[in-house]
Amino acid sequence: CRTSECCFQDPPYSDADSGSASGPRDLSCYRISSAGYECSWQYEGPTAGVSHFLRCCLSSGRCCYFATGSATRLQFSDQAGVSVLHTVTLWVESWARNRTEKSPEVTLQLYKSVKYKPPLGDIKVSKLAGQLRMEWETPDNQVGAEVQFRHRTPSSSWKLGDCGPQDDDTESCLCPLEMNVAQEFQLRRRRLGSQGSSWSKWSSPVCVPPENPPQPQVRFSVEQLGRDGRRRLTLKEQPTQLELPEGCQGPAPGVEVTYQLQLHMLSCPCKAKATRTLPLEKMPYLSGAAYNVAVISSNRFGPGPNQTWHIPADTHTEPVALNISVGTNGTTMYWPARAQSTTYCIEWQPVGQEGSLATCNLTAPQDPDPAGMATYSWSRESGAMGQEKCYHITIFASAHPKKLTLWSTVLSTYHFGGNASAAGTPHHVSVKNHSLDSVSVDWAPSLLSTCPGVLKEYVVRCRDEDSNQVSEHPVQPTETQVTLSDLRAGVAYTVQVRADTAWLRGAWSQPQRFSIKVQVSD
């Protein structure tokens, strides 16, 4: 007979049972795959020189045997000659020292005798009184089991534990929980009340984080402010440096840390709500305001420590979007309006005093005026932006002012307060000969030049005192010098300089007289 087949001959020993207390017992046979079967048994007593024979009788009455030598486990296929679809009777005969010992018989239909499965599918993990509780659905048709677990940490080997008997549609186990290290658990089952039956395979790893989540390690980047006045915050999550047991390396569910983003909008403190918490996956769009961002880490057991960053305000400015008119009654700002019923927040602070709290005003929801503009006015008495200095103005808008992530920047610009026309007049105008018919005019920078984007240009005016002809020369706001050409010798000229903003013509500087000397030839 071939070793892979059940041999339909008489076994090579006498079949009288000695009836001793030792011998084979706890025979269990299972189907382990679509066409594979396994029988295993225990052998009580000295094993030296023992030969085992697995006996099988078919329903027809024909019997066969497998010789397994000293092995107490046998695997065979559906090609071994054993009737797996009909009921068969199996037992083990162990032969040693001219004596045969026989196990109790088992009668079963092998194809339907499926080996116990480990916990399958979703194993729910929770914390219970400082311990770990695992719960799972009992595999189909397998109610009544003994369950064991084994667990390890990244630095320890497997330790075995017992879950006790289970007898319900759901099974559970209490296991130890580690404070600061991740653990890998596996579970296995066997039929209840059959000590000799074989254990199922170990379950897939159940990966359990430490009780305390690790400190979040995250870096972020903020995109440029878009045309809609919003910028996307992107958080680049660095792998948490949590050491994992071998079976939990890779995308193991259960040990993952979830992060929440807590946003605090620092700009515009007069608005209704300054803080919002949202999941890290929902990367928000932010206005150009300054924010504090906290990332709060939590795992399946709850929140852990957090980490906070500061996102500075977007300093990109729109030099011409804001129109400011100063009248006798006060000052009015105009800017391109957003949608109907938009709330605006106007914030300003003197340049150089960014550490101090900005002044802030929240408008009532307003619709665009006929020219498509939104406005904000204040009286001279209020003293707002009344000093002759540079102010940084930011306007934010929201149709839903209570929703922090729906604010956008309308504009960010600079404004020179007080009497900008007079305060901006250039001083120290000087004239130097340049050539036979030209001069160089220099002046000290206007105070307006300290206010980014406010100074539109300088204008240099030259008047011929003889003919009263006037010429004006625009000069870039970054320049403080111009050359006047095509001048006539011996003629008196007056030169003046003014500094203009986009909405205001500056005051002329004091007139400066000069003339080019007539060259006398020898």
């Epitope: 679509s34 066409a35 329903s59 559906d78 090609q79 054993v82 797996v84 679809l85 009909h86």
Partner: nanobody, 124 residues
Framework: QVQLVESGGGLAQAGGSLRLSCAAS????????MAWFRQAPGKEREFVAH????????NYADSVKGRFTISRDNAKNTVYLQMTRLKPEDTAVYYC?????????????????WGPGTQVTVSS
């Protein structure tokens, strides 16, 4: 001449049903164990379902359990395979087989008589 002939195959939608029949002639099959096997292109012939001679016991492959039902009508010398909740992976040629020796195995080579097969195609 001993013959098994399958019928009822064809095209079905995923989730749909088909009923295969296997008619036996040339001898009395009422004493034989009967089974259905299937073979997909490039794969080995695999066991699907088995019914013993008096329909007292049935067995099913794990992949079809709960979806397929094997039955027999000994008076008509016919075996049936009711297939429900069909899946694209059920696409194969389905064969009917008889085991007069009651080997009671899922190994196709122990079956003495075979039909020519009927094609079942399940589209998604």
């Amino acid at each position: 001449q001993v013959q098994l002939v399958e019928s009822g195959g064809g095209l079905a939608q995923a989730g749909g049903s088909l009923r295969l029949s296997c008619a036996a002639s040339g001898r009395t099959f009422s004493n034989d164990d009967m089974a259905w096997f299937r073979q997909a292109p490039g794969k080995e012939r695999e066991f699907v379902a088995h019914i013993d001679r008096n329909a007292a016991s049935t067995n099913y492959a794990d992949s079809v359990k709960g979806r397929f039902t094997i039955s027999r009508d000994n008076a008509k010398n016919t075996v049936y395979l009711q297939m429900t909740r069909l899946k694209p992976e059920d696409t194969a040629v389905y064969y009917c087989a008889a085991d007069p020796d009651h080997f009671g195995t899922t190994w196709y080579q122990q079956y003495t008589y075979w039909g020519p097969g009927t094609q079942v195609t399940v589209s998604s």
